[in-house]
Interface confidence: medium
Amino acid sequence: MKVLQEPTCVSDYMSISTCEWKMNGPTNCSTELRLLYQLVFLLSEAHTCIPENNGGAGCVCHLLMDDVVSADNYTLDLWAGQQLLWKGSFKPSEHVKPRAPGNLTVHTNVSDTLLLTWSNPYPPDNYLYNHLTYAVNIWSENDPADFRIYNVTYLEPSLRIAASTLKSGISYRARVRAWAQCYNTTWSEWSPSTKWHNSYREPFEQH
């Protein structure tokens, strides 16, 4: 049994890091493998993660962490029984994938303005809470070409756009994702999308 693709890990910088790897053949990850991880810090103890299958030869493990700070470094040992298959390390702050924003809501009752709001996925005491910026994706269900991205570079989890920038009488969907420049993170997953019917009063055309 050998590792074909070495484990790569990303952290949500809160409580979970996810590691994925591939074996050289079909593997029952949960029965055959164990990923041991240990914070390199003052008497920290080793913890065991039981991997799950992620495709035939792929495995994924969700490492639970009490909290994360930028200096944290973990040793990782991948075992098959008594055989050490791979040894490495992982610094969560250098491989951050933020949690996805939640509770995306479209408020259509403001005159000819769409207000989109969502929730910051981190509690106020987490470092990322004040460092997230967002991308909002809006698209038409009827027209695949009507697809746009709005970058929200301020901290407030909201976006205002004029309803008239979208077509009237059409259903739209929106979703939002987050990233943090301070840790050069990857983008989060997209939030669940929300749907609304766009309608606004067309101004009278002047001839």
Epitope: L42, L43, S44, E45, D66, D67, V69
Partner: antibody, heavy 121, light 107 residues
């Protein structure tokens, strides 16, 4: 009730031995690393020793290394400090303290009331 | 070992006044610094950990700041029960060390 209760302190002569105990209640004891911290009369706090949740790993202040041994019995929810070759400068109130999170996170959010150890001839 | 130096040694203030306590480390401790309060005959009580995080049940008038080598504990408006000795503690490296303490007394 969540608490730590030390016992075993007393008066003894230099060179003597003593074992302190710290009984924990209301917490999942084995989850948490623990420490002993002491305070000489009228003085500040001095960290003495630390032990991991499983008891596998320990660390000691230089002033007690080789003389004091920290251990724990997770089945009894009890922490111990075996003190040998005691000196006058070991006279202090000894506190056991629990780390704030299972990480371990070496700040202490739960302390016992302390037990007084007096070493004097 | 990392030496923590607290200043001033004694702070004489009246209830309602603002208290500012300092703790300086001999080398960087990142943000791994905590503050404790101790009253006579009692065990210490954790106030702040990791420089600025208030421990459970600690009133908002207590706040911590700083990183690296210089840290501050601020009590925005002293209450009668806030008088006592305050210690800083680092968890950046062995041995764990405490500062010598700052006594906050009633003026």
């Amino acid at each position: 009730e969540v608490q730590l209760l030390e016992s075993g302190g007393g008066l003894l002569q230099p060179g003597g031995s003593l074992r302190l105990s710290c009984a924990a209640s209301g917490i999942t004891f084995s989850t948490y690393a623990m420490s002993w911290v002491r305070q000489a009369p009228g003085r500040g706090l001095e960290w003495v020793s630390a032990i991991s949740g499983s008891g596998d790993s320990t660390s000691y202040a230089d002033s007690v290394k080789g003389r004091f041994t920290s251990s724990r019995d997770n089945s009894k929810n009890t922490l111990y400090l075996q003190m040998n070759s005691l000196r006058a400068e070991d006279t202090a109130v000894y506190y056991c303290a629990k780390v704030i999170a299972a990480r371990p996170h070496w700040n202490f959010d739960l302390w016992g009331r302390g037990t007084l150890v007096t070493v004097s001839s | 070992e990392i030496v923590l130096t607290q200043s001033p040694a004694t702070l004489s203030l009246s209830p309602g006044e603002r208290a500012t306590l300092s703790c300086r480390a001999s080398q960087s401790v990142s943000r791994y610094l905590a503050w404790y309060q101790q009253k006579p005959g009692q065990a210490p009580r954790l106030l702040i950990y990791d420089a600025s995080n208030r421990a459970t049940g600690i009133p908002a008038r207590f706040s911590g700041s700083g990183s690296g080598t210089d840290f501050t504990l601020t009590i925005s408006s002293l209450e009668p029960e806030d008088f006592g000795v305050y210690y800083c503690q680092q968890r950046s490296d062995w041995p764990l060390t405490f500062g010598g303490g700052t006594k906050v007394e009633i003026k």
